[in-house]
Interface confidence: low
């Protein structure tokens, strides 16, 4: 009963001229051990002789006849379970059907396996996920329907022709279910990889090129922006004009909206790629950036720090502490907004300049009664001198002096 023969092997095997083919195969013949095995190429049943005709690639019989192909074709199986075969090297004209003619004491069986041998090494196939987004790790898969113990190969990943640094995991399958070589590369694409060519290159053991597959990366990313400002140092004086320009260096998909932000807050009615600031005031100093959005999300440019320079504003004096007790220490602080910061201060006590006092702070370690009075200051920077503020009063408390009776 020929239904007792059960085989498992890949239905079709793929190779190319000069490579080899390893055919994983198992079988079961319930009525006893294998007595004769013949491997045919394109066998055809001859009704007249009740035998199969065809090229005999391998023969293992009781009488020990060995065809000339025996060195190239090897039966690596056994008498009851394993029917694995190897053809090394494999040739173009090996394409077609291999027929495994099995005979036990009472039963015969012809098992057919398809062999597809191409003239040149066929290319692997790169599989990409449906979407690739910047900075999100993806797995690139390169698959080749080939693996053979006698013909080592390697799959090499290239980005724009340069080997990729990321470590790829290569796996092979040489089982009765499947024969393939697979390389998986975990890769976190950056926006700059958009449009770049990824290649999976099939190489022999010496690194010689055999074939390849290429794909163009479609990396979804937020808009990438450059901000340009006139004047280029972004330092202006009050009343000057400033122009900022936003340039989209890359966006995938296309951008949809444009906005400008100052200190993180959106500027109203500023939805073009140029921001014109006329007759700027000091209040317009701050960090500016443009924001352009696409379906992936918003992209922001680097921040430009706009410095609107102005002469010091009217100053105020802060006294720590008033009233002060005679003998205690007191500190005066000159407060004046200015850009750039004041480089020189002039202090006044009761309307008279205090010689040698040019710092922002004045420290008097031991207060005397005559230190009481009005203190004011003037701040100065490269753009001018500020207005002297109203000043502040220092009260000094002290015990009675030179008591006289009247």
């Amino acid at each position: 009963d020929s239904s007792k023969w059960v085989f498992e092997h890949p239905e079709t095997l793929y190779a190319w001229e000069g490579a080899c083919v390893w055919i994983p195969c198992t079988y079961r013949a319930l009525d006893g051990d294998l007595e004769s095995f013949i491997l045919f190429h394109n066998p055809e049943y001859n009704k007249n002789t009740s035998k199969f005709d065809g090229t005999r690639l391998y023969e293992s019989t009781k009488d020990g006849k060995v065809p000339s192909e025996q060195k190239r074709v090897q039966f690596l199986g056994d008498k009851n379970k394993n029917c694995t075969l190897s053809i090394h090297p494999v040739h173009l004209n090996d394409s077609g059907q291999l027929g495994l003619r099995m005979e036990s004491k009472t039963e015969k069986w012809m098992e057919r396996i398809h062999l597809n041998v191409s003239e040149r090494p066929f290319p692997p196939h790169i599989q990409l996920p449906p979407e690739i987004q910047e900075s999100q790790e993806v797995t690139l898969t390169c698959l080749l329907n080939f693996s053979c113990y006698g013909y080592p190969i390697q799959l090499q990943w290239l980005l724009e022709g340069v080997p990729m640094r990321q470590a790829a995991v290569t796996s092979t399958s040489l089982t009765i279910k499947s024969v393939f070589t697979r390389s998986e590369l975990k890769f976190s694409p950056q926006w700059s990889h958009h449009g770049k060519i990824v290649t999976c290159q099939l190489q022999d053991a010496d690194g010689k090129f055999l074939s390849n597959d290429t794909v163009q990366l479609n990396v979804k990313h937020t808009p990438k922006l450059e901000i340009k400002v006139t004047p280029s140092d972004a330092i202006v004086r009050e009343g000057d004009s400033v122009t900022m320009t936003c340039e989209v260096s890359s966006s995938n998909p296309e951008y949809t909206t444009v906005s400008w932000l100052k200190d993180g807050t959106s500027l109203k009615k500023q939805n073009t790629f140029t921001l014109n600031l006329r007759e700027v005031t000091k209040d317009q100093s701050g960090k500016y950036c443009c924001q352009v959005s696409n379906d992936v999300g918003p992209g922001r440019s680097e921040e430009v720090f706009l410095q609107v320079q102005y002469a010091p504003e009217p100053s105020t004096v802060q006294i720590l502490h008033s009233p002060a007790v005679e003998g205690s220490q007191v500190e005066f602080l000159c407060m004046s907004l200015a850009n750039p910061l004041p480089t020189n201060y002039t202090w006044y006590h009761n309307g008279k300049e205090m010689q040698g006092r040019t710092e922002e702070k004045v420290h008097i370690p031991k207060i005397l009664p005559w230190h009481a009075g009005t203190y004011s200051c003037v701040a100065e920077n490269i753009l001018g001198t500020g207005q002297r503020g109203p000043g502040a009063e220092l009260d000094v408390q002290y015990p009675p002096k030179k008591v006289t009776t009247v």
Epitope: T12, Y14, N116, H125, Q127, L128, P129, P130, E131, Q133, L143, N145, S173, K177, S178, F180, R182, V215, Q216, N218, K220, P253, D295, V296, G297
Partner: antibody, heavy 118, light 116 residues
Framework: EVQLVESGGGLVKPGGSLKLSCAAS????????MNWFRQAPEKGLEWVAY????????YYADTVKGRFTISRDNAKNTLFLQMTSLRSNDTAMYYC???????????WGQGTSVTVSS | QLVLTQSSSASFSLGASAKLTCTLS???????IEWYQQQPLKPPKYVME???????STGDGIPDRFSGSSSGADRYLSISNIQPEDEAIYIC?????????????FGGGTKVTVLG
């Protein structure tokens, strides 16, 4: 329980337009890519369009490219298919389908019928 | 070109085991596919995702009588102890992104009839 409910189908003349909607519930809509598929009477299934979670990526079948527009409103858990320049061979049952795993179309709506006829 | 091939129909006796085949085009023999079940006048129902190594994950509400296996370019859907409610068209599907275009193709479907 995951539910996808399509609406907006009907009878339309050739060259006309229709907008299909799909209301999603029972899952976090913004976590999944969504598709439209269709099935003409007595015919096989045909993929129509795909939209990624955040509408970043959109793909169309060649047969509808330039005529159909897929979109989604994650705030309202709704998928749309705007169909214009409709042809008689667009007549089909249109299904809203969630995509998970590798390409697993794991939940299908009951479908909405579109008939294009003069 | 990505192609899936299925036989058009198959009949099985009630309680028997069924094995349906979906064959991938040879250059895509390592792809993951999906199996769907479609009963008359109903939408398709996701049955499972099936990998080259035979590992699979089944959809919600799919009985464990359904299993998957693979051999080369062939992907199998097996139904043990087949029941009348299993009578349906079983369709395999596969997705890929080629260059910049996404494709999702289906096999022609196998109509399963349960006898007895």
């Amino acid at each position: 329980e995951v539910q996808l409910v399509e609406s907006g189908g009907g009878l339309v003349k050739p060259g006309g337009s229709l907008k299909l909607s799909c209301a999603a519930s029972g899952f976090t809509f913004s976590d999944y890519g969504m598709n439209w598929f269709r099935q003409a009477p007595e015919k096989g299934l045909e993929w129509v369009a795909y939209i990624s979670r955040g509408s970043h990526t959109i793909y169309y079948a060649d047969t509808v490219k330039g005529r159909f527009t897929i979109s989604r409103d994650n705030a309202k858990n709704t998928l749309f298919l705007q169909m214009t320049s409709l042809r008689s061979n667009d007549t089909a049952m249109y299904y809203c389908v969630r995509m998970a795993g590798y390409y697993a179309m794991d939940y299908w709506g009951q479908g909405t019928s579109v008939t294009v006829s003069s | 070109q990505l192609v899936l091939t299925q036989s058009s129909s198959a009949s099985f006796s009630l309680g028997a085991s069924a094995k349906l085949t979906c064959t991938l085009s040879s250059q895509h023999s390592s792809y993951i596919i999906e199996w769907y079940q479609q009963q008359p006048l109903k939408p398709p129902k996701y049955v499972m995702e099936l990998k080259k190594d035979g590992s699979h994950s089944t959809g919600d509400g799919i009985p464990d009588r359904f299993s998957g296996s693979s051999s080369g370019a062939d992907r199998y859907l097996s139904i043990s102890n087949i029941q009348p409610e299993d009578e349906a068209i079983y369709i395999c599907g596969v997705g890929d992104t080629i260059k910049e275009q996404f494709v999702y193709v289906f096999g022609g479907g196998t109509k399963v009839t349960v006898l007895g």
